[in-house]
């Protein structure tokens, strides 16, 4: 997977009046890395690993960048002409990637009230607009504003691309991201299925990086894909990931089955516990909402695009 840096900024307005704050989160390699703390007026690292990336350096540069971007986005929202009454949101997502072959990608996407209306490839400076008439109108509106703003010149977009990559390289240089390995905690549970059958579930949690092999084995041989059910590998909000795999087996044959886990060159096997342990899987499976993003989005049903 490529290394990536992703900026998520959102500003809100009510009856055309744009709020003075903004919401921002930065993800590094898919993990929550920084967020803008409005109360402290600063970019704050998300967890110890994020702090380790910059070591004893301050986050002033990140704060300055996010504040500047937030200000730009507020101005952009203020210039959207079709703002009707009520609550509206403008979200900008900017992503840059460095691939294994050292090639790079950068893009920028704008969403209004959760709907994508404008994308730009920051390398080719090519704009893409979805077909809907609303998106076309919004895109024209925003592009005209960006053109009027002397800052938003060809050089500006090149700089956005270069700055994002420069920051990503700076973070990677610390070695923290590249070296970081958190082994999973593996937990096997069983629950009643139908007559004579039980469902066994193997959960791996709190691991990093996200690449993992988790599979059920019978007598040491991996079960076929179609006899197993896998959960997505999802961020758990703590800078690590979680996933699960389940299968249905005959009661009494538990000792023939093991959960096999492979992660970052290490592997382990985990037997099915004896006894009847009933578990609710739904909570665990769905416990992956907006990676600790401000509750505002949850409360106001503002869509946060991943």
């Amino acid at each position: 997977e490529p290394h990536s840096l992703r900026y998520n900024l959102t500003v809100l307005s009510w009856d055309g009046s744009v709020q003075s704050g903004f919401l921002a989160e930065v993800h590094l390699d898919g993990q929550p890395f920084l967020r803008y703390d409005r109360q402290k007026c600063r970019a704050k690292p998300q967890g110890q690993w994020a702090e380790d990336v910059l070591g004893n350096k301050t986050w002033d540069r990140e704060t300055r960048d996010l504040t500047g971007n937030g200000k730009d986005l507020r101005m952009t929202l203020a210039h959207i002409k079709d703002q009707k009454e009520g609550l509206h949101s403008l979200q900008e997502i900017r992503v840059c990637e460095i691939h294994e072959d050292n090639s790079t990608r950068s893009s920028q996407h704008f969403y209004y009230d959760g709907e994508l209306f404008l994308s730009q490839n920051l390398e080719t400076e090519e704009w893409t607009v979805p077909q809907s008439s609303r998106a076309q109108t919004l895109a024209m509106n925003v592009r005209n504003f960006l053109k009027e703003d002397a800052m938003k010149t060809k050089t500006h977009y090149h700089a956005m691309h270069a700055d994002c990559l420069q920051e990503l390289r700076r973070y990677l240089e610390s070695g923290v991201v590249l070296r970081r390995t958190v082994p999973p905690m593996v937990n096997v549970t069983r629950s009643e299925a139908s007559e004579g059958n039980i469902t066994v579930t193997c959960r791996a949690s709190s691991f990093y990086p996200r690449n993992i092999i988790l599979t059920w084995r019978q007598d040491g041989v991996s079960l076929s894909h179609d006899t197993q059910q896998w959960g997505d590998v999802l961020p758990d909000g703590n800078g690590t990931y979680q996933t699960w795999v389940a299968t249905r087996i005959c009661r009494g044959e538990e000792q023939r089955f093991t959960c096999y886990m492979e992660h970052s060159g290490n592997h382990s096997t985990h037997p099915v516990p004896s006894g009847k342990v009933l578990v609710l899987q739904s909570h665990w499976q769905h416990h992956h909402h907006h990676h600790g993003l401000n509750d505002i989005f949850e409360a106001q049903k503002i869509e946060w695009h991943e």
């Epitope: 409005r38 109360q39 402290k40 007026c41 106001q300």
Partner: antibody, heavy 116, light 107 residues
């Protein structure tokens, strides 16, 4: 523990300038947060006047913009309020407080009377 | 500017009773609201931020609720030390403004 303490003249004549100082202990004003001035009029109405952020940027209440200035002395960990051309309606208790959105630490306040 | 209205200026409640103090904003403020308690001769003290988040050290009998334009501070099992004036404050956009206050007394 974070502590803020206001100090000032107590009495100012109309049309003069008012200068107040907020001394912060237990926290560096250049670390983070915004550092605010808030006043409370005799009828208990509270008014946010403005702030200076940890980085030195300022934001003022538009109702006071032409008269207000907030500055700081980082070596003394102090920030200041200057209000020009005061009138009797500026009589109030003046508080300094910490926070970029809401105010989690306040000083005890200093009472200022504008009178000739 | 956003105006915060606390319609009830005075409230008289029995000891051990339940109190709700309302705060209405002139615009949608997206839960960006704080509640303060002020006792005579003291500075205001932060109780709740983001409409519902209780500050450290604030008794659990205090709670905040609401959304959009309408917000409420609730106090269950009223104690004598809760006698004070309560203010709401928004931080949707500058200038940040305060409500006019609700003075709470024991019946």
């Amino acid at each position: 523990e974070v502590q803020l303490e206001e100090s000032g003249p107590g009495l100012v004549k109309p049309s003069q300038s008012l200068s107040l100082t907020c001394t912060v202990t237990g926290y560096s004003i250049t670390s983070d947060y915004a550092w605010n001035w808030i006043r409370q009029f005799p009828g208990n109405k509270l008014e946010w006047m403005g702030y200076i952020s940890y980085s030195g940027s300022t934001n003022y209440n538009p109702s006071l913009k032409s008269r207000i200035s907030i500055t700081r002395d980082t070596s003394k960990n102090q920030f200041f309020l200057q209000l020009n051309s005061v009138i009797t309606e500026d009589t109030a208790t003046y508080y300094c407080a910490r926070g970029g959105t809401y105010f989690d630490y306040w000083g005890q306040g200093t009472t200022l009377t504008v009178s000739s | 500017d956003i105006v915060l209205t606390q319609t009830t200026s005075y409230l008289s409640v029995s000891l051990g009773g339940r109190v709700t103090i309302a705060c209405k904003a002139s615009a949608h403020i997206n839960n960006w609201l704080a509640w303060y308690q002020q006792k005579p001769g003291n500075a205001p003290r932060l109780l709740i931020s983001d409409a519902t988040s209780l500050e450290t050290g604030v008794p659990s009998r205090f709670s905040g609720s609401g959304s959009g334009k309408d917000y409420t501070l609730s106090i269950t099992s009223l104690q004598t030390e809760d006698v004070a004036t309560y203010y709401c404050q928004h931080y949707w956009s500058t200038p940040w403004t305060f409500g006019g206050g609700t003075k709470l007394e024991i019946k």
